[in-house]
Interface confidence: medium
């Protein structure tokens, strides 16, 4: 059903990183516009991105209200310039998105090494606790605030002079590793949620090496 000059949206896809969440779809509109609605399983539909010619809609503000809820979105198609027009069934064409549970599915953003500090044969590597758009009491929560102990970081480190990598894991944002005295090391970290079935790992952080700006070195 639907009007003769509109086509239903298709390929509805959730794109979400650290809870910044955008719904994308096709096709690029020709003589039509779109409106998006989002709802939890038990909630009412809320309209967003009214009569847009875009093929994406930022739904972050809705999903961050409760990242453990499961959300469903739908995209309505309307004839351009005649948005009151409906299909033969009495409502505009629409297509449903897949269900989306942000806590289980949002991609983990690329982490950043905040600092590293060498004290003798130990190096303390600190991962930046990235801010998300999830709020509590008017404060933006960090990734660690949201995921708690479900989130770990994996550190990859190696001597600048060789390619053999070692790994360490932490469920805080800090690593304390043993290094050989007098050697320079390079570091990269990855955020991981081990118990997820999808989107378990982030991409690796940019590599940081000792002897460059970011670190501090103290010989004991």
């Amino acid at each position: 059903s639907g009007t003769t000059n509109t086509v239903a949206a298709y390929n509805l896809t959730w794109k979400s990183t650290n809870f910044k969440t955008i719904l994308e779809w096709e096709p690029k509109p020709v003589n039509q516009v779109y409106t998006v609605q989002i709802s939890t399983k038990s909630g009412d539909w809320k309209s967003k991105c009214f009569y847009t010619t875009d093929t994406e809609c930022d739904l972050t503000d809705e999903i961050v209200k409760d990242v453990k809820q499961t959300y469903l979105a739908r995209v309505f198609s309307y004839p351009a310039g005649n948005v009151e027009s409906t299909g033969s069934a009495g409502e505009p064409l629409y297509e449903n998105s897949p269900e989306f549970t942000p806590y289980l599915e949002t991609n983990l953003g690329q982490p950043t090494i905040q600092s590293f500090e060498q004290v003798g044969t130990k190096v303390n590597v600190t991962v930046e606790d990235e801010r998300t758009l999830v709020r509590r009491n008017n404060t933006f929560l960090s990734l660690r605030d949201v995921f708690g102990k479900d989130l770990i970081y994996t550190l990859y480190y190696w001597k600048s002079s060789s390619s053999g990598k070692k790994t360490a894991k932490t469920n805080t944002n800090e690593f304390l590793i043993d290094v050989d005295k007098g050697e320079n090391y390079c570091f990269s970290v990855q955020a991981v949620i081990p118990s997820r079935t999808v989107n378990r790992k982030s991409t690796d952080s940019p590599v940081e090496c000792m002897g460059q700006e970011k670190g501090e070195f103290r010989e004991i």
Partner: antibody
Framework: EVQLVQSGAEVKKPGASVKVSCKAS????????MNWVRQAPGQGLEWMGE????????TYNQKFKARVTMTVDQSTSTVYMELSSLRSEDTAVYYC???????????WGQGTTVTVSS | SIVMTQSPDSLAVSLGERATINCKAS??????IAWYQQKPGQSPKLLIY???NRYTGVPDRFSGSGYGTDFTLTISSLQAEDVAVYYC?????????FGGGTKVEIK
Amino acid sequence: EVQLVQSGAEVKKPGASVKVSCKASGYSFTGYYMNWVRQAPGQGLEWMGEINPSTGGSTYNQKFKARVTMTVDQSTSTVYMELSSLRSEDTAVYYCARRELGGPFGYWGQGTTVTVSS
Amino acid sequence: SIVMTQSPDSLAVSLGERATINCKASQSVSNGIAWYQQKPGQSPKLLIYFASNRYTGVPDRFSGSGYGTDFTLTISSLQAEDVAVYYCQQDYSSPWTFGGGTKVEIK
């Protein structure tokens, strides 16, 4: 297939200790927290604590903190729960349970009956 | 710690009829609620997590709803194999706590 296999039934005297094991298989052992939950005869479920098999770090219910110790042996994918200074009210079935992402317990061991009797 | 109060303590429902179990938290737990089924002599089995998400392999006659402090588990059409004790559990704030259980029987 995920499996949690617990050690057999134990009968203990008041004041003694008991150590219950839970051997995991069929998944990445270090990727999931392991919890211990007990159930007294005819009663409900009571959470005792959890252990991170990757680090060995544990969090205990305040009620049991002075008497419970949870440990891990990564080489055998086994977690242990030791409860000391046993009393008759510790008679219960003790379960290990794997904590899924976000908190719920998705897989449970078959349970170990511990009877405390003089 | 958060206290979970289940009602009723027991429930007798005819085969094919709807069974409804309630769970109330002493403070808001958002949607951090799980529901478990325990049959006699067996370990508990996870049915619902995040208040309304069915766990893998759970029949769709089981559904969960609620948010904040009040939650419901519904069995839309009771089957003989559903006879069990059902527990709610909050996984919002440690220590994780369970309701006292609701025994579901056939009328």
